[in-house]
């Protein structure tokens, strides 16, 4: 089920998610799940042919983020 934004944001800001802080939003299946069920994207080695792990996720709150703010993963920092 789609929801309208909770607040006006810049074009590049992550969209809010309907999850409580205890869960994360899975962009692939578009619903909330336990954060441990998601896999963070990792850099793919050159020439690797195996499928990448599940990605596309939005933790509902990052450390220091306000309630209701979504935090996008930062693959380059993992």
């Amino acid at each position: 089920m789609r929801r309208g934004p909770r607040s006006l944001r810049g074009r590049d800001a992550p969209a809010p998610t309907p999850c409580v802080p205890a869960e994360c939003f899975d962009l692939l299946v578009r619903h909330c799940v336990a954060c441990g069920l998601l896999r963070t994207p990792r850099p793919k080695p050159a020439g690797a042919s195996s499928p990448a792990p599940r990605t596309a996720l939005q933790p509902q709150e990052s450390v220091g983020a306000g309630a209701g703010e979504a935090a996008l993963p930062l693959p380059g920092l993992l």
Epitope: V20, A22, H31, C35, L38, A65
Partner: antibody, heavy 118, light 113 residues
């Protein structure tokens, strides 16, 4: 103020059914996740499951120990949640709590005792 | 399922003592994308419902006294009561909500010495 009040506990025979209620006040159940947790007499806590909010289609998650026997639902007009328990076993004897889920299990009711015995 | 192991299972302490309870999980509870550990601590007094003290391993719930603190990351966590008060004698539980089913430690009973 958030308040949760459980009711419906009692004595039931093995194989029987019981429906527990969790009356919520201070918040709308349409916009909240609510969990059920149980505690056998003198034992620790065991998570039963939870129901998500309206934005998530009231989807549910269950502990494998109760999946297929227990069902969580809600009546938004009464701002009440339910735990339907079928095929009850002696090991289901416990105090059953409902709790609002936000950052963890944030607010808890006082619990209702379910005894499964012949 | 993730197993949560608390130690000790019980302890005796006096008012004013510093008390430390540990909790180990069978797998990491750290979600690397936001650096949150999905671990909570609860206090339960006899005949009462549990009360949330700490979430995300180290964030104190609103209204919880500052003498309660949580620390740790990954698989090893600690709840510390810096100066035990008479109202702190209770059973304490850790709980993971990193994945389903949510699981609790077996509890640590803090008794009066």
């Amino acid at each position: 103020e958030v308040q949760l009040v459980e009711s419906g506990g009692g004595l039931v025979q093995p194989g029987g059914s019981l429906r527990l209620s969790c009356a919520a006040s201070g918040f709308p159940v349409t916009g909240s996740y609510v969990s059920w947790v149980r505690q056998a007499p003198g034992k620790g806590l065991e998570w039963v499951g939870f129901i998500r909010d309206k934005a998530n289609g009231y989807t549910t998650e269950y502990n494998p120990s109760v999946k297929g026997r227990f069902t969580i639902s809600r009546d938004t007009s009464k701002n009440t949640l339910y735990l339907q328990m079928n095929s009850l076993r002696a090991e289901d004897t416990a105090v059953y709590y409902c709790a609002q889920v936000r950052r963890a299990l944030d607010y808890w009711g006082q619990g209702t005792l379910v005894t499964v015995s012949s | 399922d993730i197993q949560m192991t608390q130690s000790p299972s019980s302890l005796s302490a006096s008012v004013g003592d510093r008390v430390t309870i540990t909790c180990k999980s069978s797998q990491s509870l750290l979600y690397s994308s936001n650096q949150n550990n999905y671990l909570a601590w609860y206090q339960q007094k006899p005949g009462k419902a549990p009360k949330l003290l700490i979430y995300w391993a180290s964030t104190r719930e609103s209204g919880v006294p500052s003498r309660f603190s949580g620390s740790g990351s990954g698989t090893d966590f600690t709840l510390t009561i810096s100066s035990l008060q008479p109202e702190d004698f209770a059973t304490y539980y850790c709980q993971q909500y990193y994945t389903y089913p949510y699981t609790f430690g077996q509890g640590t009973k803090v008794e009066i010495k």
